[in-house]
Interface confidence: low
């Protein structure tokens, strides 16, 4: 059963910059990646960045940088430009659109304990199948 | 610069095990997935299917699946095709080649090995 | 399965004339069709990918158009080294698919 994973890591250096992994873990292959916080695409949640294989990527303030790590694994680096982090509480979802098997989505955050520099592990969790 | 190197010619008699090895260089190996074509004597090319060389997931096109499978050593760059209780009609050039990664299905072979003739007779 | 058909089967032409190769698809496959060119005893070398796009390092004399299901792979003034097996391929869906090749010879 394909899986998706999110890793939500907070930069040592910069407490305000925040770097959100997803990967996708199954047989096919990836036609579309959407990026949300506060909740998945399209259920309350506001879209960051869309990455497309052959198009090219698109993200929106406070996305920085949005790019492919390895034929199944994105990263979306966040700046947060005020005072306080609003990252640190904020649930972020990765949809990945995959041939042949449809959509899926997971949602990973900060772990409340996480110290600069650390990074909360891969973590499966519910996955959402929106075919 | 980015290479593929495949293994030798085989020669094998109906029912055995073959392992054909393609060895990549030059390039981050887990970036790319790897596409298995084979070629009879005189004749096209035959996807076979490809691997996820980062989540090491296979998938076959239908003619062939059952008595072959695709595997990875990543620490040392390699892609595998095994070919079980092999029949006269596997006899053929089999391409290991590089995907472009990214591709929306997976589809644009940049790079292939130089082919390893298999020969099954008995 | 989506079946590619190319034509003609063998093309001879004489160095220095410009000649088309056409790959028709079964079904609309979009722009996602790539040509490979195949010497005898080498593996095949893609020349373009996706219908027109040129890959780094393929001479500017090979440039490729269509979209849906007619695609055509152009060379303008062919050269010696051009000579051999022309495929098609789609990766629309799956299985991926090849078309029978056109063999490109010397008149």
């Known amino acids: 059963t394909p899986e998706v994973w999110v890793q939500v890591q907070m930069e040592a250096t910069e407490l305000s910059s925040f770097t959100v992994h997803c990967g996708f873990l199954g047989p096919g292959s990836i036609s579309l990646v959407t990026v949300s916080w506060g909740g998945p695409d399209g259920a309350g949640g506001t879209k960051l960045a869309v990455l497309h294989p052959e198009l090219g990527t698109r993200q929106w303030a406070p996305a920085r940088q949005a790019r492919w790590e390895t034929q199944s694994s994105i990263s979306l680096a966040l700046e947060d430009s005020g005072a306080s982090s609003p990252f640190a509480n904020t649930t972020f979802c990765c949809k990945f659109a995959s041939f042949p098997e449809g959509s899926w989505e997971s949602c990973g955050s900060l772990p409340p304990s996480s110290d600069p520099g650390l990074s909360a592990p891969p973590t499966p969790v519910p996955i959402l199948r929106a075919d | 610069q980015i290479q593929l190197v495949q293994s030798g010619p085989e020669l094998k008699k109906p029912g055995e095990t073959v392992k054909i090895s393609c060895k990549a260089s030059?390039?981050?190996?887990?970036?790319?997935?790897m596409s298995w074509v084979k070629q009879a004597p005189g004749k096209g090319l035959k996807w076979m299917g490809w691997i996820n060389t980062y989540s090491g997931v296979p998938t076959y096109a239908d003619d062939f699946k059952g008595r072959f499978a695709f595997s990875l050593e990543t620490s040392a760059s390699n892609a595998y095709l095994q070919i079980n209780n092999l029949k006269n009609e596997d006899t053929a050039t089999y391409f290991c080649a590089r995907e472009l990664p990214f591709t929306t299905i997976i589809g644009t072979k940049d790079y292939w090995g130089q082919g390893t003739t298999l020969t099954v007779s008995s | 399965d989506i079946v590619l058909i190319q034509s003609p089967a063998t093309l001879s032409v004489t160095p220095g004339d410009s000649v088309s190769l056409s790959c028709r698809a079964s079904q609309f496959i979009s722009n996602n069709l790539h040509w490979y060119q195949q010497k005898s005893h080498e593996s095949p070398r893609l020349l373009i990918k996706?219908?027109?796009q040129s890959i780094s390092g393929i001479p500017s004399r090979f440039s490729g158009g269509g979209s849906g299901t007619d695609f055509t792979l152009t060379v303008n003034s062919v050269e010696t080294e051009d000579f051999g097996m022309y495929f098609c391929?789609?990766?629309?869906?799956?299985?991926?698919?090849f078309g029978g090749g056109t063999k490109l010879e010397i008149k």
């Open positions: 030059g390039y981050t190996f887990t970036t790319y997935g």
């Open positions: 996706y219908a027109s």
């Open positions: 391929q789609q990766s629309n869906s799956w299985p991926h698919t």
